[in-house]
Amino acid sequence: TEVKVIQPEKSVSVAAGDSTVLNCTLTSLLPVGPIRWYRGVGQSRQLIYSFTTEHFPRVTNVSDATKRSNLDFSIRISNVTPEDAGTYYCVKFQRGSPDTEIQSGGGTEVYVLAK
């Protein structure tokens, strides 16, 4: 059965300067390959977080993604600014050269409220 990417919240609201959690769970880790978070869609989408060795300021994983059975790929964005508003997608890739996108969550829209 094909892996499914579940983003339970359609939208979240957060006050500027606060933190927010964007939830994402997978139904399987197979096929092997990375999971990445993007804001927006298409060619202009912006990489927000990758569950590899890269480090992203203000964005951290919520659960221990080094667990071999981990299916929780939620992230926390800290010190949110108005520029962080947009729709965030949790995306599963199959390994390759380059990696191939095989499934995306439905997206979570982040609304940033004035402090």
Epitope: P31, V32, T66, R68, S97
Partner: antibody, heavy 118, light 107 residues
Framework: DLQLVESGGGVVRPGESLRLSCAAS????????MSWVRQAPGKGLEWLAG????????YYIDSVKGRFTISRDNSKNSLYLQMNSLTAEDTAVYYC???????????WGLGTLVTVSS | ALTQPASVSANPGETVKIICSGG??????YGWYQQKSPGSAPVTVI????KRPSDIPSRFSGSASGSAATLTITGVRVEDEAVYFC???????????FGAGTTLTVL
């Protein structure tokens, strides 16, 4: 500079126990899963056990399950391997290794030699 | 089990390919580990199929397809003489395995 330094090896008799340590430095130890790998004399590499970054999840090869226990103390930047009921077949150089995000290995320690002999 | 040739040899400057088979592309990632003498610390030359650590020369490259992974050394040097172990992580079983090792001799 990233460093992994094993210690605790030595000569023990069959049936005895030994605890190996691996001191990590030069990286954020608490962010990485870790593993123990051994190499018997004249043989290849054999993965033994792995542990998640937080220490809550552990994984073992069948042949050491129940005898060996992997653990870690992130406050001390240290990884451990408790080995019980040792036999001559456990004679090997034991390496600790840092895991990549997909559970392969990117850095290795220099190893510590364990000899089990009567 | 991972299968790799027991030995390969090459002249300096030649290209060497070492193939490791036995994994499942759907669930397995591969790495390659260099050991210059028995009991010395292994050095990772490739992980995640094709990722080269920053301190490894660019003549080392890796690829994976189907049930096999390949380590390629382009323009092999005398200092590349070593035993090369392929390793794999299986996302189905959560287990790591290694091949028996390939001894590279540079003539």
């Amino acid at each position: 500079d990233l460093q992994l330094v094993e210690s605790g090896g030595g000569v023990v008799r069959p049936g005895e126990s030994l605890r190996l340590s691996c001191a990590a430095s030069g990286f954020t130890f608490s962010s990485y899963a870790m593993s123990w790998v051994r190499q018997a004399p004249g043989k290849g590499l054999e993965w033994l056990a792995g542990i998640s970054a937080g220490g809550s999840d552990t994984y073992y090869i069948d042949s050491v399950k129940g005898r060996f226990t992997i653990s870690r103390d992130n406050s001390k930047n240290s990884l451990y391997l408790q080995m019980n009921s040792l036999t001559a077949e456990d004679t090997a150089v034991y390496y600790c290794a840092r895991e990549t995000w997909n559970h392969l290995f990117d850095y290795w320690g220099l190893g510590t030699l364990v000899t089990v002999s009567s | 089990a991972l299968t790799q040739p027991a030995s390969v040899s090459a002249n300096p400057g030649e290209t060497v390919k070492i193939i490791c088979s036995g994994g499942d592309y759907y669930s397995t990632y591969y790495g390659w580990y260099q050991q210059k003498s028995p009991g010395s610390a292994p050095v990772t030359v490739i992980h995640s199929d094709d990722k080269r650590p920053s301190d490894i020369p660019s003549r080392f490259s890796g690829s994976a397809s189907g049930s096999a992974a390949t380590l390629t050394i382009t323009g092999v040097r005398v200092e590349d003489e070593a035993v090369y172990f392929c390793g794999a992580y299986d996302g189905r079983t959560y287990i790591n395995t290694f091949g028996a090792g390939t001894t590279l001799t540079v003539l």
